[in-house]
């Protein structure tokens, strides 16, 4: 594996610039990234953005194959952290280092016109065993079996309409099917019922992906318990980083400090969603190209 060490100095990135300009700036900076051999860990150090600081002084390190749970209130910077890992947000200070290819499961699931299978494979070469494993782990077997055309059922324009839960599971399956070194899962269970969520968290995130490096944005204590490391963000800063047992020991302290606190992005929900949608669209178009 090659490790891309990303070092950027005095890069100013505003969400206000609009994503188009930001994307072009990120692409220009991409050309200056140096590749060197390194270990298999994902390393973050000292992040901040000039202007409106979306993330400030974030530090964490997760080894290959570990699960990092990222939590925090609305607007704390959880999705922004994932955007930065994907290179869609550029840090003004600090450095990012990670290995190999990234697969991203967005908070807002999407479906393209095409069959169920095409939506999951999404341009990646077909592997029957891998495909069946993913379908099973994402609890899609029963749903697919009910359609007359099974996984050749057409979705989108002129096709059948899926429920929110089915869309979410197909979106997750798409991300998991892609063979990557790092999986970014942005609140993938938001539209799932709790029974399905528990099954998928166990069978997919904990078992099928056990040897993969995973970053899961979640608010669930059950997920935090199973994570190797936990990162809690508050107003763009790292308020806690450590293990669940360490979190339990600290809880009374930071609970009293932050009682009732909640922060929101400076943009409206519509603005945030439009930015994320455009980000996801651009990221999806790059297909299997290594993002690092």
């Amino acid at each position: 594996l090659t490790t891309t060490e990303v070092v950027m100095e005095n890069v100013t990135a505003f969400w206000e610039e609009g994503f188009g300009e930001l994307f072009e700036k990120a692409k220009q900076n991409n050309n200056n990234r140096k590749t060197s051999n390194g270990d298999d860990s994902l390393f973050f150090s000292n992040f901040s953005l000039l202007g409106t600081p979306v993330l400030k002084d974030i530090n964490f390190k997760i080894e290959r194959g570990q699960l990092l749970a990222v939590a925090g209130s609305t607007g704390a910077g959880k999705t922004s952290l994932l955007m930065m890992i994907m290179g869609e947000l550029e840090p003004s200070e600090g450095k990012i280092k990670h290995s190999g290819r990234i697969s991203f499961c967005p908070q807002f699931s999407w479906i393209m016109p095409g069959t169920i299978k095409e939506n999951i494979i999404f341009g990646v070469s077909y592997d029957e065993y891998r495909y069946r494993s993913v379908i099973k782990a994402c609890q899609l077997e029963e749903d697919i079996s009910k359609f007359p055309e099974k996984d050749n059922t057409v979705l989108g324009e002129g096709g059948i309409t899926l429920s929110g839960g089915q869309r979410a599971r197909i979106s997750l399956a798409r991300a998991v099917y892609k063979d990557a070194d790092l999986y970014l899962l942005d609140s993938p269970f938001g539209y799932l019922d709790v029974l399905t969520e528990k099954e998928i968290f166990e069978s997919c995130v904990c078992k099928l992906m056990a040897n993969k490096t995973r970053i899961l944005v979640t608010s669930k204590m059950e997920h935090l318990k199973k994570a190797d490391k936990i990162l809690i963000l508050h107003e763009g800063s790292s308020y806690f980083y450590g293990t669940f047992s360490e979190l339990q020991n600290l809880q009374p302290d930071f609970s009293s400090k932050l009682m009732g606190c909640d922060s929101f992005d400076q943009f409206s929900a519509e603005r945030r969603n439009s930015i994320l949608t455009e980000t996801l669209h651009r990221f999806s178009l790059e297909g299997d190209a290594p993002v690092s």
Epitope: G164, G190, Y191, D193, V194, S219, K220, F254, M259
Partner: nanobody, 123 residues
Framework: QVQLQESGGGLVQAGSSLRLACAAT????????MGWYRQAPGKQRGMVAI???????DYADSVKGRFTISRDNAKNTVYLQMNSLKPEDTATYYC?????????????????WGQGTQVTVSS
């Protein structure tokens, strides 16, 4: 201490309606997803309907078009309006909610379940 209490169950004739309610009480800061699940004798518990904090809904295929889930965030209550009931809807109905207690920081949630309310539909 957080509790979920269901109400509204009972014995009804096929084709009639019932409205279930579930109120969350206790030291609650916020509630994310809420939902209704049911379990018939000898069967596994399964989802009936869920509703997100902002009102997005999802239903089991078997109840689509007949059941409607709604919630009142101010009252920390979720409802299930059940129309055109069938004998196969007979089950114990459980309420579920993802709740952040006042003592929890950063809006971290735990899963809570109600004790269940019996719905029996006779033919």
């Amino acid at each position: 201490q957080v509790q979920l209490q269901e109400s509204g169950g009972g014995l009804v004739q096929a084709g009639s309606s019932l409205r279930l309610a579930c109120a969350a009480t206790g030291s609650i800061r916020s509630i994310n997803n809420m939902g209704w699940y049911r379990q018939a004798p000898g069967k596994q518990r399964g989802m009936v309907a869920i509703i997100t904090r902002v009102g997005n809904t999802d239903y089991a295929d078997s109840v689509k078009g007949r059941f409607t889930i709604s919630r009142d965030n101010a009252k920390n209550t979720v409802y299930l309006q059940m129309n055109s009931l069938k004998p196969e809807d007979t089950a114990t109905y459980y309420c579920h909610a993802e709740i952040t207690e006042q003592s929890r920081p950063f809006y971290l949630t735990d899963d809570y379940w109600g004790q269940g309310t019996q719905v029996t539909v006779s033919s």
